[in-house]
């Protein structure tokens, strides 16, 4: 014969545990029903009556099947540097994440405790590593032949335009200026910069010094981290 289905509350067999969505009440010594997400235990079970559940009040929640006497309070409203990506409901807590242009400098279990503005790279520097939800932008000096003339958390170093006749040479923070009579062309987007030695423009007129113990780059891509500033001493 199939075992009879027990209805809560019931006394468990010695050595066995209560079923899914049930809990063992120490006082009643019975298996009793848990309350569903969005509810809490208003009255605990006895030997003869099951748990009485009630809905969570405004600004409180329970996310799991539970037998807590009170629902949990939702977190405080999101700050001005945050956006609410999950509203406070009876079944879930409010989740605040950093708004665009910011990153999470101090996270909590869900969402972010402290947001900080993404670093902006000044002219002569470009974004080498973009910011993410949890990490800041990293800026690097623009490589010879590239420049950035903006203060931006997204702009990378761009290639100087190539002139038939250069009126003003470009540097790390300024594009080359061509003479108006000569036709110009820009380096194709996504073009690979020719491999650069680790020596920089400030060393081009002298023998290359002993190599740095820092790792060197073999190939430089316009999108990638860029080596040294060209013209950054404003010669």
């Amino acid at each position: 014969l199939p075992a009879q289905v027990a209805f809560t509350p019931y006394a468990p067999e010695p050595g066995s545990t209560c079923r899914l969505r049930e809990y063992y009440d120490q006082t009643a010594q019975m298996c009793c029903s848990k309350c569903s997400p969005g509810q809490h235990a208003k009255v605990f079970c006895t030997k003869t009556s099951d748990t009485v559940c009630d809905s969570c009040e405004d600004s409180t929640y329970t996310q799991l099947w539970n037998w807590v006497p009170e629902c949990l309070s939702c977190g405080s409203r999101c700050s001005s540097d945050q956006v609410e990506t999950q509203a406070c409901t009876r079944e879930q807590n409010r989740i605040c994440t950093c708004r665009p242009g910011w990153y999470c400098a101090l996270s909590k279990q869900e969402g972010c405790r402290l947001c900080a503005p993404l670093r902006k790279c000044r002219p002569g520097f470009g974004v080498a590593r973009p910011g993410t939800e949890t990490s800041d932008v990293v800026c690097k000096p623009c490589a010879p032949g590239t420049f950035s003339n903006t203060t931006s958390s997204t702009d990378i170093c761009r290639p100087h335009q190539i002139c038939n006749v250069v009126a003003i040479p470009g540097n790390a923070s300024m594009d080359a200026v061509c003479t108006s009579t000569s036709p110009t062309r820009s380096m194709a987007p996504g073009a690979v910069h020719l491999p650069q030695p680790v020596s920089t423009r400030s060393q081009h007129t002298q023998p290359t010094p002993e190599p740095s113990t820092a790792p060197s780059t073999s190939f430089l891509l316009p999108m990638g981290p860029s080596p040294p500033a060209e013209g950054s001493t404003g010669d």
Partner: antibody, heavy 119, light 106 residues
């Protein structure tokens, strides 16, 4: 907290070289360039150059191009500045300072290293 | 390089005074000008960056402004700990410090 700790004072003879170190802690060393700035006794501040520890790339002030070499060892988060063919007017306190490439420039400095050049 | 002309080179003032120090850049340097404070035997300390922005932890009596190519550091009410040497620093087109202003107690 962010710290830049420099090597101790040096006394050198004219014509010799000196190598000053700057050990960084409290931040990601490769995310910042390191500037070197010097100050002769009773004088102002003079920018010498920078190094990007991530790639070893450098940029030097014209005045120092032929005599200075800046390097970095990322394994020990340390930047180095070597000045060769020393003269008496190189007697100065040499400082390192970090810079993240944002408008917030040189927000942390080493304590300085006095280099005395004397025969 | 862009030369930075700082004035005055020295200045005597009393506690409570309002003090201004000026730096002039011959060319346009955008707003990439910083001010540093240095006390004897100590490393410089960043006070203001990008002409106007106060570095974290710096008292609000320090402020920066500009008019054309003239950049100004103002200390609204001098405190005893403010007597030091101040340097401007441009970092838009290369890097260049001003000559410094020594602020002394009158």
């Amino acid at each position: 907290q962010v710290q830049l700790v420099q090597s101790g004072a040096e006394v050198k003879k004219p014509g010799a070289s000196v190598k000053v170190s700057c050990k960084a802690s409290g931040y990601t060393f490769t995310d910042y360039i390191i500037h070197w700035v010097r100050q002769a006794p009773g004088q102002g501040l003079e920018w010498m150059g920078w190094i990007d520890p991530d790639y070893g790339n450098t940029d030097y002030a014209d005045k120092f191009k032929k005599r200075v070499t800046m390097t970095a060892d990322t394994s020990i988060s340390t930047a180095f500045m070597e000045l060769s063919r020393l003269r008496s007017d190189d007697t100065a306190v040499y400082y390192c300072a970090r810079d993240d490439g944002s408008p917030l420039v040189m927000d942390a400095w080493g304590q300085g290293t006095l280099v005395t050049v004397s025969s | 390089d862009i030369q930075m002309t700082q004035s005055p080179s020295s200045l005597s003032a009393s506690v409570g005074d309002r003090v201004t120090i000026t730096c002039n850049g011959a060319q346009n340097i955008d707003n990439y000008l910083a001010w540093f404070q240095q006390k004897p035997g100590k490393a410089p300390k960043l006070l203001i960056y990008s002409t106007y922005s106060l570095q974290t932890g710096v008292p609000s009596r320090f402020s920066g402004s500009r008019s054309g190519t003239d950049f100004t550091l103002t200390i609204s009410s001098l405190q005893p700990e403010d007597f030091a040497t101040y340097f401007c620093f441009q970092y838009n087109n290369g890097y260049m410090f001003g000559g410094g202003t020594k602020l002394e107690l009158k």
